[in-house]
């Protein structure tokens, strides 16, 4: 089949006339909306068949699909058909009219469907909304077909703007009919309860109108009956719920609760189970280890995290040096406790741009009327090392000394090194480490002081050089867990003038 113009999509002007031609090796016919519009059919001398469809005085209502197919069923590739889609942008036509049955979309399984709201102009922006909502739904739109996706049982409308007026389509109603497969879900208000509290479970079955619920529960083993209540969720068609309520739970009520749902028409069934734990009294339990010594780096933010399990929900307090902490208005401290599962919690203390004063003894206490737990640790603020001073002196004894002073937390290590060949060292040759070597060319004396108020160590190290016969680059490197700092000084022999 050959169609001219070939399409597959044409945009034609309103009020214009347009000619479509289809030709093939057997009789052909144009179809529009399952009908054959008036057309001229002919047979050429070469045996080719054709059909000419003349569209006159086009309006927006001529927008749609046009098919050319073989006109007989003599086995000449009868399934071959050519499709052409024509748009006739027409500001007087909003959405193309639908048959009544197109407004009601019924389905029996979860499958993709199309809401067939179509416009005459492929340039228009069309959005889909729930009938009672303004928010556009994120569903892909095809100007030739409409919105396709998986839809809930709701009412939908399409909207577009033509010129400066907003146009709404008719409402489309999506109905999911009763289906025979059973999908059961079971959930509990709480899966952990204290004895004396209530257990409430819900079993919901979707997609069937008539079902039978059967619960099995630990209490039944003892012949203690629980009467479930069945109701219909009115806002959700074919959602039937069975509620199992046990007042004043006992320890023996711990165990597996199973909801079995049967549907007698097709004899389908499904069951789901959930575990319930009844505890004698509430509990708070730490999960995982938190070291008794924690570190934070000066001026960096640090979050300290404690994970624990508790039931019922606990109160969580943080203390520093036995004083209660709260979220500070200056934003220096943030406290948060998140419920990450029914009984699991994560409590976090965040120190923003840590200061030296925030070092100290921290405690987290989680408690309720039945139990409590606390966790303590020492927070050490780590301060990167700084070399504060590197100086050289010539005592009368003839030796030369270099003094290096620096600070940091934790305690810095000091490394002395020297370059004798100033041209090549340290780029080409490694520096020589200095220290209390056996050759006694150099001697080292190091003193360490802890400054309580600043909560850091000060290191003072003096390097004594016995005889310096040529210029020497002496380097002092301080290093600790959070950084290092280096300074160097040129030491010249006594005899050399500066």
């Amino acid at each position: 089949l050959v169609v001219t113009p070939p399409g597959p999509e044409l945009v034609l002007n309103v009020s214009s006339t347009f000619v479509l031609t289809c030709s093939g090796s057997a009789p052909v016919v144009w179809e529009r909306m399952s009908q054959e519009p008036p057309q001229e059919m002919a047979k050429a001398q070469d045996g080719t068949f054709s059909s000419v469809l003349t569209l006159t005085n086009l309006t927006g209502l001529d927008t749609g699909e046009y098919f050319c197919t073989h006109n007989d069923s003599r086995g000449l590739e009868t399934d071959e058909r050519k499709r052409l889609y024509i748009f006739v942008p027409d500001p007087t036509v909003g959405f193309l009219p639908n048959d009544a049955e197109e407004l009601f979309i019924f389905l029996t399984e979860i499958t993709e469907i199309t809401i067939p709201c179509r416009v005459t102009d492929p340039q228009l922006v069309v959005t889909l909304h729930e009938k009672k909502g303004d928010v556009a739904l994120p569903v892909p739109y095809d100007h030739q077909r409409g919105f396709s996706g998986i839809f809930e049982d709701r009412s939908y409308i399409c909207k577009t703007t033509i010129g400066d007026r907003e146009v709404d389509s008719d409402a489309y109603y999506v109905y999911r009919l009763q289906v025979s497969s059973i999908n059961v879900s079971v959930n509990a208000v709480q899966t952990v309860v204290r004895q004396g509290e209530n257990i409430t479970l819900m079993c919901i079955v979707i997609g069937n109108e008539v079902v039978n619920f059967e619960w099995t529960y630990p209490r039944k083993e003892s012949g203690r009956l629980v009467e479930p209540v069945t109701d219909f969720l009115l806002d959700m068609p074919y959602h039937i719920r069975s509620i199992l309520h046990i007042p004043s739970a006992e320890l023996e009520d711990s165990g597996t609760y199973t909801c079995n749902v049967t549907e007698s028409v097709n004899d389908h069934q499904d069951e789901k189970a959930i575990n319930i734990t009844v505890v004698e009294s509430g509990y708070v339990r730490l999960l995982g280890e938190v070291g008794t010594l924690q570190f934070a780096e000066l001026h960096r933010s640090r979050t300290l995290q404690v994970v624990f399990e508790a039931y019922p929900p606990p109160t969580v307090l943080w203390f520093k040096d036995n004083r209660t902490l709260g979220d500070s208005s200056a934003g220096e401290i943030a406290l948060s406790t998140r419920n990450v599962s029914e009984t699991r919690y994560v409590s976090e203390l965040t120190l923003v741009r840590v200061k030296v004063a925030e070092a100290g003894h921290y405690t987290m206490r989680a408690f309720h009327e039945d139990a409590e737990v606390q966790l303590s640790f020492q927070l050490q603020i780590n301060v990167p090392v700084r070399v504060l001073e590197l100086s050289e002196s010539h005592p009368d004894s003839g030796e030369q000394t270099v003094r290096c002073r620096g600070r940091g937390m934790p305690q810095p290590n000091i490394i002395w090194s020297a370059c004798r060949d100033l041209k090549r060292c340290p780029r080409e040759l490694p520096p020589t480490l200095l220290g209390n070597s056996s050759e006694e060319e150099s001697q080292l004396e190091t003193n360490v002081t802890y400054w309580e108020e600043e909560q850091e160590f000060e290191v003072v190290s003096t390097l004594r050089l016995q005889h310096v016969d040529r210029p020497l680059s002496v380097r002092c490197t301080l290093r600790n867990a959070v950084g290092q700092d280096t300074q160097e000084v040129i030491v010249v022999p006594h005899s050399l003038p500066f």
Epitope: T216, K220, E221, S222, G223, R224, L225, E227, P247, S248
Partner: antibody, heavy 116, light 107 residues
Framework: EVQLVESGGGLVQPGSSLKLSCLAS????????MYWIRQAPKKGLEWIAL????????YYADSVKGRFTISRDNSKNTLYLEMNSLRSEDTAMYYC?????????WGQGTLVTVSS | DIQMTQSPPSLSASLGDKVTINCQAG??????IAWYQQEPGKVPRLLIR???KLESDTPSRFSGSGSGRDYSFSISNVESEDIASYYC?????????FGGGTKLELK
């Protein structure tokens, strides 16, 4: 200690009425479903009625349905069995029971004799 | 109603014998069966629940088994204090129903 004490039994004529009571103690009465069971002389056991803890649901054996009514007063820790249109085959020892470990707690029973 | 057919109605045993009582339910009762002992002039006493779970005061010579519709109750080593009537009870479906009872006597 769980105790169930039945009362109200006696000799009545066929067609007449009787109301049995069962006073419960030693447990939280309002948390438990309660039952009546009977045993005819030299015969077996027959379950006759059940009432749920909250007074909402009641079940009966076919043999007593429409004639007997089970009820409870949780504020008085008391279970009742109102028996109307009594027949000779209702002659039995009537036991009140608490639902745990099916029928693990029994009262001593009260004897109902229906005879002309 | 679920019919419970208990057999035999009576049983003679010598001390030290093993005896077995059977109960057949009219339908699957999913192991929800209990066994009671009733001595003459006394109230029934629960021995076993949920097919095979012995009550805390039930001697270990008593046992229960079964599934679906067929259940049995055994005394492995009959003692004189075991002379009584025994009843099965299905408590899967309301109305709960008892078996007709088995009277155990000494030979």
């Amino acid at each position: 200690e769980v105790q169930l004490v039945e009362s109200g039994g006696g000799l009545v004529q066929p067609g007449s009425s009787l109301k049995l009571s069962c006073l419960a103690s030693g447990f939280t009465f309002s948390n438990y479903n309660m039952y009546w069971i009977r045993q005819a002389p030299k015969k077996g056991l027959e379950w006759i009625a059940l009432i749920f803890y909250d007074n909402n649901n009641k079940y009966y054996a076919d043999s007593v349905k429409g004639r007997f009514t089970i009820s409870r007063d949780n504020s008085k820790n008391t279970l009742y069995l109102e028996m109307n249109s009594l027949r000779s085959e209702d002659t039995a020892m009537y036991y009140c029971l608490r639902d745990s470990g099916p029928f693990s707690y029994w009262g001593q029973g009260t004897l109902v004799t229906v005879s002309s | 109603d679920i019919q419970m057919t208990q057999s035999p109605p009576s049983l003679s045993a010598s001390l030290g014998d093993k005896v077995t009582i059977n109960c057949q339910a009219g339908q699957n009762i999913k192991k929800y069966i209990a066994w009671y002992q009733q001595e003459p002039g006394k109230v029934p006493r629960l021995l076993i629940r949920y097919t095979s779970k012995l009550e805390s005061d039930t001697p270990s010579r008593f046992s229960g088994s079964g599934s679906g519709r067929d259940y049995s109750f055994s005394i492995s080593n009959v003692e004189s204090e075991d002379i009584a009537s025994y009843y099965c009870l299905q408590y899967d479906n309301l109305p709960w129903t008892f078996g007709g009872g088995t009277k155990l006597e000494l030979k």
